[in-house]
Interface confidence: low
Amino acid sequence: MSLLSVPHTESVSLSTGSTVTIKGRPLVCFLNEPHLQVDFHTEMKEDSDIAFHFQVYFGNRVVMNSREFKIWKEEVESKNMPFQDGQEFELSILVLEDKYQVMVNGQAYYNFNHRIPVSSVKMVQVWRDISLTKFNVSN
């Protein structure tokens, strides 16, 4: 199976019903504190606003947030850790009318209410300490 380069960035156009699917594996064991970060940007620039920020501190916690005008907003944290040490994962982010529904390995994980209109999302970036085997957007 061929690996995608990380960081991986793609132009996207999201609307209600869209699903972003990411499949990969942590590069190192959880003792070494690998991270996964997924950002939904409003422009094709890394310093642009982020409608949805999803960061996994593998084996520890998951943090979700948004960034507007370069300012991070109220952080949401979950200690629920659905990712398994050394195991491949499938992360799906479903765009619902009022929120993003995050699924991990087919199981509902968290709902994050929209703070920035989904229609403004232009780019998704997946990065940090993972090997990436799949990135797909279905509308």
Epitope: L4, P7, H8, T9, M44, K45, M123, Q125
Partner: nanobody
Framework: ELQVVESGGGLVQAGGSLRLSCAAS????????MAWFRQAPGKEREFVAA???????TYADSVKGRFTISRDNAKNTVTLQMNSLKPEDTAAYHC???????????????WGQGTQVTVSS
């Protein structure tokens, strides 16, 4: 190892056209996504256009409808056709090759020295 060299820059009046070319050396050219970035004096490097291995492309909002990116895998070249040029398009234009289709400069491993485009009003 891939080497990229840009050409085709120059001085043009507003409303005019230029065609930039990027020649790549290396048999692996077709396995790379390619992009054009530009950098004006005192400003950070800015994404212009990118093209996938198979020819899918995307553009910065500021050039959409005016610029066209294309590639010829047989000739190891990428071109950027620039029409309806504006003074704000003035910059050094850099061609880049990378393993992923991206808008982020650090995703690209190989860079050309750049070709200067100056648009006068």
């Amino acid at each position: 190892e891939l080497q990229v060299v840009e050409s085709g820059g120059g001085l043009v009046q507003a409303g005019g056209s230029l065609r930039l070319s990027c020649a790549a050396s290396g048999r692996t050219f077709s396995t790379y996504s390619m992009a054009w970035f530009r950098q004006a004096p005192g400003k950070e490097r800015e994404f212009v256009a990118a093209i996938t291995r198979s020819g899918g492309n995307t553009y910065a909002d500021s050039v959409k409808g005016r610029f066209t990116i294309s590639r010829d895998n047989a000739k190891n070249t990428v071109t950027l056709q620039m029409n309806s040029l504006k003074p704000e398009d003035t910059a050094a234009y850099h061609c880049a090759a990378g393993g992923t289709y991206s808008f982020v400069p650090r995703s690209y491993n190989y860079w050309g020295q750049g070709t200067q485009v100056t648009v006068s009003s």
